[in-house]
């Protein structure tokens, strides 16, 4: 139902990274605008993006209240320059999102080597612990504050010399790996929460390699 | 219903080729790491190589480098192993297993195995 | 590579023991060690994982520890279906590498 000249949305898509969230919808306006409400299950619905010809809308402050939680959104669809015009049953045309609870389904945003330090045959490879949206005491939490020990690194690492990628693991951001002397050797990092079943992996880091100003070599 | 199926084993004479197939169901190969292990007639595990499908990194056991190759078709949700220049010490059931990527990184799914045999 | 030494090879026991298996790695694997059941003609099923967890189904006579470099697999009390060969399996680095087995057997 709803008015003649409005069409519900459709294909409302759910689009996170390290806890950034927006919801996407279709289609392209034309003559009308949308309002997004989001709600928990158990909670109120809070109106967002109000009469916007967008068909996307960030729901990252709502979300990032309490990731743990499961969220659905709502699009309604309004004539445009008539937005109090309802559908014949008396309420605008709406459309609900698939459910989604941030903390099982964000996507792991590409992480990044920080750093690399060689002391003799180990190298330390550090990963950079990204900041997310989610705060807590007023200030913004990273990737490992929010996930803990449900997160884990693979280190992808090869003689440059070589095509065979060694693996380690590490539920910190940090790796201690023994190395061949005298060989360089070039890393690239993966996060990966390994209790879920989808969207488990990031995309891998970019390659850093040694011998490039990254890294720090001393020799023991 | 996590599942892996090996196929493509049989009888091959030294030297010749194969190509074992490891098909699954119930998850989606490109968000974990498929090993291949293999096993002599009467003897223990031996670990083979792995592929991320995600990235395409192998890495393979000194005995089988530059003989065996690793391979993934995310879009058949299958893992294959192709093995050339084949040795009778290469005959063994061959298992492919899922890794869950852990930090401990156990092989928590099997599939049933293929026996290949090298023999003239 | 890592090796992991298990003993011992073969054992003897009968329906209610309480059976021990141990692993020892050449080197620090942390808590990087899984152990297997494995049945004539079968896949090996995962039993233990990060060195002391159950994993989910497995009965709860099975347990694991780990002491420095030293690796224990105990069976309580021996079921009849505890009949097996039994496998560790180290994955702290490239390569995994296993124990060489140890067949649990019925006196």
């Known amino acids: 139902s709803g008015t003649t000249n409005t069409v519900a949305a459709y294909n409302l898509t759910w689009k996170s990274t390290n806890f950034k969230t927006i919801l996407e919808w279709e289609p392209k306006p034309v003559n009308q605008v949308y309002t997004v409400q989001i709600s928990t299950k158990s909670g109120d619905w809070k109106s967002k993006c109000f009469y916007t010809t967008d068909t996307e809308c960030d729901l990252t402050d709502e979300i990032v209240k309490d990731v743990k939680q499961t969220y659905l959104a709502r699009v309604f669809s309004y004539p445009a320059g008539n937005v109090e015009s309802t559908g014949s049953a008396g309420e605008p045309l709406y459309e609900n999102s698939p459910e989604f609870t941030p903390y099982l389904e964000t996507n792991l945003g590409q992480p990044t080597i920080q750093s690399f330090e060689q002391v003799g045959t180990k190298v330390n490879v550090t990963v950079e612990d990204e900041r997310t949206l989610v705060r807590r005491n007023n200030t913004f939490l990273s990737l490992r504050d929010v996930f803990g020990k449900d997160l884990i690194y693979t280190l992808y690492y090869w003689k440059s010399s070589s095509s065979g990628k060694k693996t380690a693991k590490t539920n910190t951001n940090e790796f201690l790996i023994d190395v061949d002397k005298g060989e360089n050797y070039c890393f690239s990092v993966q996060a990966v929460i390994p209790s879920r079943t989808v969207n488990r992996k990031s995309t891998d880091s970019p390659v850093e390699c040694m011998g490039q100003e990254k890294g720090e070599f001393r020799e023991i | 219903e996590v599942q892996l199926v090996e196929s493509g084993g049989g009888l091959v004479q030294p030297g010749g080729s194969l190509r074992l197939s490891c098909a699954a169901s119930?998850?989606?190969?490109?968000?974990?790491?498929i090993h291949w292990v293999r096993q002599a007639p009467g003897k223990g595990l031996e670990w083979v190589g792995y592929?991320?499908?995600?990235?395409?990194?192998?890495y393979y056991a000194d005995s089988v480098k530059g003989r065996f190759t690793i391979s993934a078709d995310t879009s058949k949700n299958t893992a294959y192993l192709q093995m050339n220049s084949l040795r009778a010490e290469d005959t063994a059931v061959y298992y492919c297993?899922?890794?869950?990527?852990?930090?401990?990184?156990?092989?928590?799914?099997w599939g049933q195995g293929t026996l290949v045999t090298v023999s003239s | 590579d890592i090796q992991m030494t298990q003993s011992p090879s073969s054992l003897s026991a009968s329906v209610g023991d309480r059976v021990t298996i141990t692993c020892r790695a050449s080197?620090?694997?942390?808590?990087?060690v899984a152990w297997y059941q494995q049945k004539p003609g079968k896949a090996p099923k995962l039993l233990i994982y990060?060195?002391?967890f159950l994993y989910s189904g497995v009965p709860s006579r099975f347990s694991g520890s780990r002491s420095g470099t030293d690796f224990t697999l105990t069976i309580s009390s021996l079921q009849p279906e505890d009949f097996a060969t039994y496998y560790c399996?180290?994955?702290?680095?490239?390569?995994?590498?296993f124990g060489q087995g140890t067949k649990v057997e019925i006196k």
């Open positions: 297993a899922r890794d869950i990527q852990s930090v401990s990184g156990e092989f928590d799914y």
């Open positions: 080197q620090d694997v942390n808590t990087a």
């Open positions: 592929i991320d499908p995600s990235n395409g990194y192998t």
């Open positions: 990060s060195a002391s």
């Open positions: 399996q180290q994955h702290y680095t490239t390569p995994p590498t």
């Open positions: 119930g998850f989606t190969i490109f968000d974990y790491i």
